[in-house]
């Protein structure tokens, strides 16, 4: 009697199941009591000897490629051996690599967590994922895992993390890069500094006083509000960041406390107050202001 090993499917894709069947064309296995055993190269598979002529392999991997055969043993201990069958497990190359961010859109607050999620639409086996920073890539991390996605985490984002990023996936058929993703780090405004600038050391009535407010840190655009004794004088915008100025033509009523507020939508900060006092110098005809 002859024995045949049949693999179904005969050319499996990585990760898919395969059924091995030990066939006896001229003998019904019910005619006699047989025990079956399946082998790869020199190693017995599954449970070893069993009464079932089938062996189900849940998932085949590239490293499972090899020479398979089966043996059948009768009660009289006569052993039949099949010819070897070569089973080649097919690996699917990675395709359609994409990089996504958490939070979505690539905008993240300074100090918050950023996750760069690298995904492949197709690909089997061990996939190596690599993350790069900058258009000319600086390798940040690599991970090898048997999954279609992998994550790289920046637990607390800093201003210096604002850059372009991309990832690369590879499973033995050459690296495949994702598209670029840009990360914008949003920075709340720092407490602004208010400076009063006058055309001369002692400003006089009708002089133009410049109120200059500047937050040294903060993502643009920044909106500055100017106050005199908590009454709004007006606002100025700094679309590209930096400071902003508000001009005031002085009258005697302009004595008192001045402050400014910076707001970039991520929070507002108020400056310390700056006091402006009128002094009347001896023998002087006009009132003067000092701060």
């Amino acid at each position: 009697a002859e024995l045949f090993l049949i693999a179904s499917p005969s050319h499996p894709t990585e990760g898919s199941p395969v059924t091995l069947t030990c066939k006896m064309p001229f003998l019904q296995s019910s005619d006699a009591q047989f025990q079956f055993c399946f082998f790869r190269d020199t190693r017995a598979l599954g449970p070893g000897w069993s009464s079932s002529p089938k062996l189900q392999i849940a998932a085949m991997w590239k490293e499972d490629t090899g020479s398979y055969w089966c043996e059948a043993q009768t009660m009289a201990s006569k052993v039949l051996r099949s010819r070897r069958s070569q089973i080649n497990v097919h690996r699917v190359p990675v395709a359609d690599v994409s990089l996504e961010t958490q939070p979505p859109g690539g905008q993240v607050m300074e100090g918050d967590r950023l996750v760069l999620i690298c995904s492949v639409a197709m690909g089997t086996g061990d996939i190596t994922f690599l993350w790069y920073k900058g258009a000319v890539g600086l390798n940040l991390q690599s991970k090898t895992q048997r999954s279609l996605t992998a994550e790289y985490e920046i637990p607390s984002v800093r201003e210096s993390d604002a850059e372009q990023y991309y990832c690369v996936a590879e499973n033995g058929y050459g690296p495949s890069p994702s598209g670029l993703v840009s990360i914008t780090v949003r920075i709340p405004v720092s407490r602004p500094i208010l400076m009063l600038r006058a055309p001369r050391a002692q400003a006089a009535v009708e002089d133009v006083l410049e109120l200059h407010c500047e937050a040294l840190r903060g993502s643009p655009p920044i909106l500055y509000w100017f106050y005199h004794e908590d009454i709004t004088l007006g606002s100025r915008s700094a679309p590209s960041g930096g400071g902003a100025s508000f001009n005031l033509s002085l009258t005697e009523e302009h004595s008192g406390n001045y402050s400014c507020e910076a707001n970039n939508g991520l929070g507002a900060q108020r400056s310390e107050a700056v006091t402006l006092n009128f002094t009347v110098p001896t023998g002087a005809r006009s009132n003067h202001l000092t701060s």
Epitope: V136, G137, P177, L180
Partner: antibody, heavy 119, light 112 residues
Framework: QVQLVQSGAEVKKPGASVKVSCKAS????????IHWVRQAPGQGLEWMGW????????KYNEKFKGKTTLTADKSTSTAYMELSSLRSEDTAVYFC????????????WGQGTLVTVSS | DIVMTQSPLSLPVTLGEPASISCRSS???????????LEWYLQKPGQSPQLLIY???NRFSGVPDRFSGSGSGTDFTLKISRVEAEDVGVYYC?????????FGQGTKVEIK
């Protein structure tokens, strides 16, 4: 297939501005940087800078800062290069090119746009 | 800025014979990530530049194997093993390691 198609030749007077377009097709526009390269008549190639169409963020060769403005319109997959305060020295062919990251090379180039500055 | 100096500036060649172009950078173009971003481009008459070699020695897809690149640090070479008629044009080396990125001044290859 990937294509970068640039706008036609321009003749401008000194002091004027010019805006050259580069329309991309056949790939995801926001996935790659677009670079600009200048070639003066009978001269070599000069790298001007790049723009990332994803967020419109440009990076300039210091030499071209203030002279050049790079922008991109995601809705039309078009990159733009604007030259201001034109002088006769700005007469050149301007190329846009796509640069592939990781492998790092310019794989596709526009056909070039000749800008002539003449009074 | 890094200056890329090519030699010779003009190279008359015989069809079927080898040709070699040298490119020297004014300082090392090894990037901080360990890669050397040295590329070679060919600009045929009336055309846009086209990529031949990237990262010193990697041939771009579709580029004939008669083209090869070599070198390290500051000295790089492009070799054509057997020149063909379609190889005429201006060859440029380019460094993309340090901003501003710079091209060599070009080498004009023509048939004798």
């Amino acid at each position: 297939q990937v294509q970068l198609v640039q706008s036609g030749a321009e003749v401008k007077k000194p002091g004027a501005s010019v805006k050259v377009s580069c329309k991309a097709s056949g790939y995801t526009f926001t996935s790659y940087n677009i670079h600009w390269v200048r070639q003066a008549p009978g001269q070599g190639l000069e790298w001007m800078g790049w723009i990332y169409p994803g967020d419109g963020n440009p990076k300039y060769n210091e030499k071209f800062k203030g002279k050049t403005t790079l922008t991109a319109d995601k809705s039309t997959s078009t990159a733009y290069m604007e030259l201001s305060s034109l002088r006769s020295e700005d007469t050149a062919v301007y190329f846009c090119a796509r640069r592939i990251h990781y492998y790092d090379y310019f794989d596709y180039w526009g056909q070039g746009t000749l800008v002539t500055v003449s009074s | 800025d890094i200056v890329m100096t090519q030699s010779p500036l003009s190279l008359p060649v015989t069809l079927g014979e080898p040709a070699s172009i040298s490119c020297r950078s004014s300082q090392s173009i090894v990037h901080s990530n360990g890669n050397t971003y040295l590329e070679w481009y060919l600009q045929k008459p009336g055309q846009s530049p086209q990529l031949l070699i990237y990262k010193v020695s990697n041939r771009f897809s579709g580029v004939p194997d008669r083209f090869s690149g070599s070198g390290s640090g500051t000295d790089f070479t492009l070799k054509i093993s057997r020149v063909e008629a379609e190889d005429v044009g201006v060859y440029y080396c380019f460094q993309g390691s340090h901003v501003p990125w710079t091209f060599g001044q070009g080498t004009k290859v023509e048939i004798k």
